[in-house]
């Protein structure tokens, strides 16, 4: 018996508006009805929780109102979007999936998505 497998893309480039999206897919060993998804950021030997959501299979993924994350779920796949990113937010974003109910509990952690964020150059003043 091994840890639950979680797959996510190796690299994602955030848009010029500071938005990055990626898919987090997990291989569920059972028929979970309640799943918790957490996005963690590892950078400079620090680990921080970016956002987290618990959802019932078949229902919408709901993050807190002030969360920088949004997402949708489809089967064993979660489509995550992180907004408001700046260059200083570049780092490894890790998808953590926990099958909460029914028992048994399972935990899976992806290998991380390196998100690169490049702050847009300010537009030069124009006389036109």
């Amino acid at each position: 018996c091994k840890a639950m497998h979680v797959a996510q893309p190796a690299v994602v480039l955030a848009s010029s508006r500071g938005i990055a999206s990626f898919v987090c897919e997990y291989a569920s060993p059972g028929k979970a009805t309640e799943v918790r998804v957490t996005v963690l950021r590892q950078a400079d030997s620090q680990v921080t929780e970016v956002c987290a959501a618990t959802y019932m299979m078949g229902n919408e993924l709901t993050f807190l109102d002030d969360s920088i994350c949004t997402g949708t779920s489809s089967g064993n796949q979660v489509n995550l979007t992180i907004q408001g990113l700046r260059a200083m937010d570049t780092g490894l974003y890790i998808c953590k999936v926990e099958l909460m109910y029914p028992p048994p509990y399972y935990l899976g952690i992806g290998n991380g998505t390196q998100i690169y964020v490049i702050d847009p150059e300010p537009c030069p003043d124009s006389d036109f």
Epitope: V47, E49, I109, N111, G112
Partner: nanobody, 127 residues
Framework: EVQLVESGGGLVQPGGSLRLSCAAS????????IGWFRQAPGKGRETVAC??????SYADSVKGRFTISRDNAKNMVYLQMNSLRAEDTAVYYC??????????????????????WTQGTQVTVSS
């Protein structure tokens, strides 16, 4: 799936020793990092130590006093606690995390990466 059960807590005098055990069932320990964490009354859960196949890592507050070890054949992880102090009084938890290539010595013990938490065992250091 992994199931963890810890044991070995109790009351000990300052300067004394205690050994905590964490037994795993349902899976081999090999693909996991096993960590010990503690929570004192009114405080958050903090890292004590963790161990994977080849590395160990300790919180600064326990370095030189606590030793973590694992016996894969018995599916056991141990925390040997020596020179105990009053500030070591807490509920101690064992937890597991899938071992990942991006873990560093500084991050492999981070509580965010862990699951399969045990119920906790009370360690009280008092005279």
């Amino acid at each position: 799936e992994v199931q963890l059960v810890e044991s070995g807590g109790g009351l000990v005098q300052p300067g004394g020793s205690l050994r905590l055990s964490c037994a795993a069932s349902g899976s081999t320990l090999d693909p996991f990092v096993i960590g010990w964490f503690r929570q004192a009354p009114g405080k958050g859960r903090e890292t004590v130590a963790c161990i994977n196949r080849s590395r160990t890592s300790y919180a600064d507050s326990v370095k030189g006093r606590f030793t973590i070890s694992r016996d894969n054949a018995k599916n056991m992880v141990y925390l040997q606690m020596n020179s105990l102090r009053a500030e070591d009084t807490a509920v101690y938890y064992c937890a597991a995390s899938p071992d990942k290539p991006f873990y560093t010595d500084q991050t492999m013990c981070n509580k965010h990466y862990y699951g399969y938490w045990t119920q906790g065992t009370q360690v009280t250091v008092s005279s």
